[in-house]
């Protein structure tokens, strides 16, 4: 019976985050909906996942692992593309595949260290080891040497017995409020907040009626809005305050006029 | 019902090696549904978790730090049963030893234990 | 290592009187679908342990229903809707979110 490598995770006690928020802890909101996020844990310095409420919360909420990795972790978009080129690949990446104790049928992807590819394999859910990525791009943008891998990734077709795992609420429910328009409307690239701050407000998927607040980037301003109680999207406050401290801070205006704060 | 049944010496000599058994029955040590481990217990450190061992394509084991230059677990498929090896004992690792079946399907937990064994290490 | 920290070591209960148990974990413990990598067991005198809840949430089979489990995050609690007698003896909780598996030092609980 050999012994599996062990997790190679390097010391980082004295690693300051990129961000105040990032210190936060991971904070699921009052709210009843499953929205799978990813927050950034400062005792392990890594992002993990969590299940988020809807509502509420905390800025240490991404949608996205990727997200939550260049925002919170210094030199990750550096070590990224450190490892794309083929300097170096962190030890994870030679570890090899671990489903883990449980048996919860995630789709992940492993660096093979044969192969010199990332590859899909199912992962149980818990207790797995570090070579075990979200998304192909992932595993190549952090193991994967792109001098090894002009032919396609082969995957095993597996979706007849692996299912996703994500207990996702549906977003795809037609928003009912009606956002005025201004002539005055940031274009994208100038808001640096919040991405969720950019989203319709959404009342979601239930039948309550509660008082919440959306950030509106069109005005720069929170808007109330009635909430249903679940689903919908993270553009949702419980007061006007908690949103504008949320998203205020991220519209940037012209260069000229200075940033509003 | 799954039963875990330990067996060993309750008495081991300092610098000796702990041998411990754990023979299963309703439940097969090659389960891909299943995890086999070893706790143990004592007044001074509570319940410890030592390693674990699971078959799925292949067999992998995990131990903790705090033992793993010592600890060896093995499945033995002849006979469904595993055993937990220690090497170097010290009265340090006086305590009881429990085998446990980890459920990989629906618990997530330890669902069933064997009855603990005390071992004493003692000249 | 996570280090899971309970409190009270021990409590002293009342039949009948509610009970409450709190386990906090050194990081955050991970929640995939909606469940929390902890459990929670009880080792009756003379006994082995048994588990109790899993999941953070889910009462294991047998497991009456005046026992429940909550929380998220670093923060967990077992509560104990009315205290029987057969309810006596040593409660951990637990974590699986990473290696070492690790276990709270156990909460005492006794009648009064």
């Known amino acids: 019976l050999s012994e599996e490598a062990d997790d190679t995770d390097s010391e980082l006690g004295s690693m300051k985050p990129l961000h105040t928020f990032c210190a936060m802890k991971a904070d699921d909101g009052p709210c009843k909906a499953m929205i799978r996020s990813y927050f950034f844990n400062m005792y392990t310095h890594q992002c993990e996942e969590f299940i988020y409420g809807g509502c509420e919360g905390n800025e240490n909420r991404f949608d996205t692992l990727e997200e939550c990795k260049k925002t919170c972790i210094p030199g990750y978009e550096k070590t990224a593309v450190k490892a794309a080129s083929g300097a170096e690949r962190p030890d994870f990446c030679f570890l090899e595949e671990d489903p883990g104790l449980c048996r919860g049928y995630m789709k992940r992807y492993l660096y093979n260290n044969q192969t010199k590819q990332c590859e899909r394999f199912v992962y149980g859910g818990c207790l797995g080891n570090r070579n075990n990525f979200e998304t192909l791009d992932e595993c190549k943008k952090i193991c994967e040497n792109p001098v090894h891998s002009p032919s396609p990734v082969n995957e095993v077709q597996m979706s007849d017995y692996v299912t996703d795992g994500n207990t996702v609420t549906d977003r795809s429910t037609v928003n009912n409020i009606v956002v005025p328009q201004s002539p005055k409307v940031p274009r994208r690239r100038d808001y640096r907040g919040r991405p969720w701050c950019l989203q319709p407000a959404d009342s979601g998927l239930c039948k309550a009626s509660e008082r919440r607040f959306y950030y509106n980037s069109a005005t720069g301003k929170c808007h109330r809005f009635n909430y249903t109680g679940c689903g919908g999207n993270n553009n949702n406050f419980t007061t006007r305050r908690r949103c504008l401290r949320s998203c205020k801070t991220g519209l940037i205006k012209n260069k000229s006029k200075g940033v509003v704060k | 019902q799954v039963q875990l049944q330990q067996s060993g010496p309750g008495l081991v000599k300092p610098s000796q090696t702990l041998s411990l058994t754990c023979a299963i029955s309703?439940?097969?040590?090659?389960?891909?549904?299943?995890?086999w481990s070893w706790i143990r217990q004592s007044p001074g450190r509570g319940l410890e978790w030592l390693g674990i061992i699971y078959k799925r394509s292949k067999w992998y084991n995990r131990y903790a730090v705090s033992v793993k230059s010592r600890i060896t677990i093995n499945p033995d498929t002849s006979k469904n049963q595993f055993s937990l090896q220690l090497n170097s004992v010290t009265p340090e690792d006086t305590a009881v030893y429990y085998c446990?079946?980890?459920?990989?399907?629906?618990?997530?937990?330890?669902?069933?234990w064997g009855q603990g064994t005390l071992v004493t290490v003692s000249s | 290592d996570i280090v899971m920290t309970q409190s009270p070591l021990s409590l002293p209960v009342t039949p009948g009187e509610p009970a409450s148990i709190s386990c906090r974990s050194s990081?955050?413990?991970?929640?995939?679908?909606?469940?929390?990598?902890l459990n929670w067991y009880l080792q009756k005198p003379g006994q082995s342990p048994q588990l109790l809840i899993y999941?953070?949430?889910n009462r294991a089979s047998g497991v009456p229903d005046r026992f429940s489990g909550s929380g998220s995050g670093t923060d967990f609690t077992l509560k104990i809707s009315r205290v029987e007698a057969e309810d006596v003896g040593v409660y951990y909780c637990?974590?699986?979110?990473?290696?070492?598996?690790?276990f709270g030092q156990g909460t005492k609980v006794e009648i009064k």
């Open positions: 637990q974590q699986y979110d990473s290696y070492p598996l690790t």
């Open positions: 309703g439940d097969s040590v090659s389960s891909d549904s299943a995890a």
């Open positions: 990081q955050s413990l991970v929640i995939s679908r909606g469940n929390t990598y």
């Open positions: 999941k953070g949430s």
């Open positions: 446990a079946r980890w459920d990989s399907d629906k618990h997530w937990g330890f669902d069933y």
